[in-house]
């Protein structure tokens, strides 16, 4: 069920996955929608408590029942992820937030004419996730016109505080407005030896890249294929970054692929959802549900229609004749990070991803017919 | 169900996945929508609490039931991800936020004429995710016209604070407005040895690239294929970045592929969703559901229709005759990051991704016909 309504002065009780800071409830829902498990959120609006350090907290929540009890809480804004909603989604947030200081790693500062230019700088910097701009009204004359480029490990501010004379906002990379070079190459037999900021298991390098693209700080990645000699690292997708924003060291190794985040790109292929079917591959993880369906397409649909489903494994029923309508077993699964915990082969399953995030790819994509 | 309404002064209780900071509830929902698991969010608006550090917090939430209990919370704005909504989505956010300082790593500062130019700089910088521009009204005269390019690990500000005289906003890369070079090549037998900011498992290098493209800080990636010698790294998608934004070292290794984020590109193919089916491939992860469907297409649709489903594996039923309607087993699964944790082959599964994010590709893409 798609619930677009937000509930003011209401907090969802329990189900906390994590807490981030966002400048608005709308952005909180955006974060929740893009979060692997977030189905509900509670956003602590400005003045929601006597403790300003709790303002702008965006509490991402999950529930096995996809609902949580609501409790009254002044200043809280609660709602549901848009995962269940049919409309086209966008990670592009052009809003700027006046008199809000979104805290993060201030890795760059420069004097620019206005907040738009500051946002443009952020959009055109690989590391920049959000920015704060000191306007001409900023109390400290010495800091006026200062554009601070920022990032955090999560892509959201560590905290958000009120600060007169500043404007904050997010990078517009997801708006397709970045002028940064779009590097679509995937490098086979390549390991990038930079900082691993995270690692996930992926069926292939393209999914790995989509994950990197969606990751707040991933700039490039290394993916270890099924043939990677170290069994424990097969299908491992290492999300990476570097201070320069580019890989520093490239190591040639068989059965590894590396590539770049597509976050700066104007996308002509999907980066948010992984529509492929992976044959003879099991995605393992938390079992959310097991249903009998006819075919991997129906199974994928079933997953797409399940707000908590991230991936599935379909085990066709054993056939002694070609009864194509016979149901196989469709395993609906989840994990903490939206990726299977392992990828196995040779078990007869057909694996793939929920298509719920496909609507998050841009309008251009959806009208392309398959070849 | 698609719930577009936001709930003011309401917080979703529990289900927290993470908390980020966003300048608006709209952007919070954007983040939630693009988050692999977020179905609901709570955004803490300005003045939502007495602690300004909690303002602009965007709490991403999930729930196995796709709902969470609502509690009253003054200043909170809660709502649902757009994952379940049918409309076209966009990650493009052209909004600028006046008097908001979005905190992050300030890695570049320069003097520009206005906020638009600052945003353009951000859009044309590989690392920049968002920016803050100090306007002519910024209190500190010396910092007026200063454009700060910013990034965070997550792509959202670490915190957001009120700051008079500044304007903040996001990079417009996802709006297709970046002038940065678009590098679409995927390099076989290539490992990029730069900083790993994250790693995911992907079925192929294209999914890996899409993930990198969607990742807030991924600029390039390395994907290790199924043939990668180190088994534990097979299908590993390493999301990478570097200070320069480009790979510093390229290592020739068989069975690895590398490439670049497409975030800067004007896309003619989808980058957000992964529509392919992966034969003889199992995606492993937390099991979300198992359903019997007819064919991988139905399975993928099932996944797509499941707001929480990210990818799937379809196991066709064993056939000895041509009964085409026979159902196979569709395992709907999810993980914390939307990618499989490992990918295995040889088990007869057909794997793929939910197509829910396909609608998130940009307007340009949908009007391009395939060759």
């Amino acid at each position: 069920e798609c619930v677009t309504k937000v509930f003011k002065d209401i907090s969802f009780q329990g189900g906390d996955l994590s807490t981030v800071f966002t400048p608005s409830a709308t952005y909180c829902r955006l974060v929740c929608t893009h979060h692997p498990r977030c189905l509900l959120f509670t956003f602590m609006a400005e003045s929601s408590s006597d403790d300003p350090t709790k303002w702008f907290a965006c509490i991402l929540k999950d529930s096995v029942t996809e609902i949580l009890p609501m409790v009254n809480m002044t200043g809280a804004i609660s709602g549901y992820s848009f995962k269940q909603c049919p409309q086209q989604l966008s990670t592009c947030s052009k809003d700027v937030y006046v008199n809000l200081d979104m805290k993060g790693m201030n890795y760059n500062s420069s004097v620019v004419k206005n907040a738009r230019e500051c946002q443009e700088r952020c959009t055109d910097d690989a590391h920049c996730q959000f920015f704060t701009y000191a306007t001409g009204y900023f109390p400290s004359v010495d800091h006026r016109k200062m554009c601070l480029l920022k990032y955090t490990r999560t892509g959201t501010p560590t905290t958000i505080t009120k600060l007169n004379g500043v404007v904050s906002g997010f990078s517009l990379k997801s708006c397709g407005l970045s002028n940064l070079a779009c590097i679509r190459d995937i490098f086979p037999n390549t390991v990038l030896a930079d900082l691993n900021i995270d690692s996930v298991v992926a069926p292939d390098a393209f999914v790995c890249r989509r994950i990197c693209t969606h990751h707040p700080t991933c700039l490039f990645f290394t993916f270890f294929s099924q043939a990677w000699p170290k069994e424990s690292q097969r299908h491992l997708c290492l999300l990476k970054t570097s201070e320069s924003g580019l890989p520093s060291t490239r190591i040639t190794k068989s059965h590894a692929l590396s590539g770049f985040s597509l976050q700066h790109c104007r996308h002509s292929v999907p980066v948010f959802c992984h529509p492929s079917f992976y044959n003879d591959t099991d995605f393992l993880g938390e079992e959310l549900d097991i249903v009998d369906v006819k075919g991997q397409e129906t199974c994928q649909k079933t997953c797409t229609n399940n707000a908590r489903c991230q991936f599935f494994t379909y085990y066709p029923s054993h056939r002694l004749c070609n009864e194509r309508n016979r149901r196989g077993r469709c395993y609906l699964k989840l994990s903490s990070n939206g990726s299977p915990t392992r990828i196995l082969h040779g078990r007869g399953g057909i694996s793939g991803y929920s298509l719920r995030l496909c609507k998050m790819d841009n309008v251009c994509t959806t009208k392309i017919n398959p070849r | 169900e698609c719930v577009t309404k936001v709930f003011k002064d309401i917080s979703f209780q529990g289900g927290d996945l993470s908390t980020v900071f966003t300048p608006s509830a709209t952007y919070c929902r954007l983040v939630c929508t693009h988050h692999p698991r977020c179905l609901l969010f709570t955004f803490m608006a300005e003045s939502s609490s007495d602690d300004p550090t909690k303002w602009f917090a965007c709490i991403l939430k999930d729930s196995v039931t796709e709902i969470l209990p609502m509690v009253n919370m003054t200043g909170a704005i809660s709502g649902y991800s757009f994952k379940q909504c049918p409309q076209q989505l966009s990650t493009c956010s052209k909004d600028v936020y006046v008097n908001l300082d979005m905190k992050g790593m300030n890695y570049n500062s320069s003097v520009v004429k206005n906020a638009r130019e600052c945003q353009e700089r951000c859009t044309d910088d590989a690392h920049c995710q968002f920016f803050t521009y100090a306007t002519g009204y910024f209190p500190s005269v010396d910092h007026r016209k200063m454009c700060l390019l910013k990034y965070t690990r997550t792509g959202t500000p670490t915190t957001i604070t009120k700051l008079n005289g500044v304007v903040s906003g996001f990079s417009l890369k996802s709006c297709g407005l970046s002038n940065l070079a678009c590098i679409r090549d995927i390099f076989p037998n290539t490992v990029l040895a730069d900083l790993n900011i994250d790693s995911v498992v992907a079925p192929d290098a294209f999914v890996c690239r899409r993930i990198c493209t969607h990742h807030p800080t991924c600029l390039f990636f390395t994907f290790f294929s199924q043939a990668w010698p180190k088994e534990s790294q097979r299908h590993l998608c390493l999301l990478k970045t570097s200070e320069s934004g480009l790979p510093s070292t390229r290592i020739t290794k068989s069975h690895a592929l590398s490439g670049f984020s497409l975030q800067h590109c004007r896309h003619s193919v989808p980058v957000f969703c992964h529509p392919s089916f992966y034969n003889d491939t199992d995606f492993l992860g937390e099991e979300l559901d198992i359903v019997d469907v007819k064919g991988q297409e139905t399975c993928q649709k099932t996944c797509t229709n499941n707001a929480r489903c990210q990818f799937f594996t379809y196991y066709p039923s064993h056939r000895l005759c041509n009964e085409r309607n026979r159902r196979g087993r569709c395992y709907l699964k999810l993980s914390s990051n939307g990618s499989p944790t490992r990918i295995l082959h040889g088990r007869g599964g057909i794997s793929g991704y939910s197509l829910r994010l396909c609608k998130m590709d940009n307007v340009c893409t949908t009007k391009i016909n395939p060759r």
Partner: nanobody
Framework: QVQLQESGGGSVQAGGSLRLSCVAS????????VGWFRQAPGKEREGVAA????????YYADSVKGRFTISQDNAKNTVYLQMDSLKPEDTATYYC?????????????????WGQGTQVTVSS
């Protein structure tokens, strides 16, 4: 010390061809963006073509697409600009430039290292 040296300029009739070369010392084209830019008297410097050496991705200004070709020889640390079907409006000083970051490929403001330029004159 980084040095970029252009060569291959000269005078040619409209419709003719020239091949410009740019060799670098103290700077490697590998894994970096290299661009050709030009500036006519009284006009702003404009991007002509660029290449990213890692994969050979190329970028061209609309005015030269189909006529100019940029290429590289990593072993010689040299980048070339093959200019065919030259027009009088192609007359300018041509500069080779190297970047050290991911850049808008045809934006001269983002390139760090520059050569001295080589003159190209196309007469009608």
């Amino acid at each position: 010390q980084v040095q970029l040296q252009e060569s291959g300029g000269g005078s040619v009739q409209a419709g003719g061809s020239l091949r410009l070369s740019c060799v670098a010392s103290g700077y490697t084209f590998n894994n970096n963006f290299v661009g050709w830019f030009r500036q006519a008297p009284g006009k702003e410097r404009e991007g002509v073509a660029a290449i990213y050496s890692l994969g050979g991705s190329t970028y061209y200004a609309d005015s030269v697409k189909g006529r100019f070709t940029i290429s590289q020889d990593n072993a010689k640390n040299t980048v070339y600009l093959q200019m065919d079907s030259l027009k009088p409006e192609d007359t300018a000083t041509y500069y080779c430039a190297g970047a050290i970051t991911w850049v808008p490929p045809l934006s001269h403001r983002r390139y760090t290292y520059w050569g001295q330029g080589t003159q190209v004159t196309v007469s009608s």
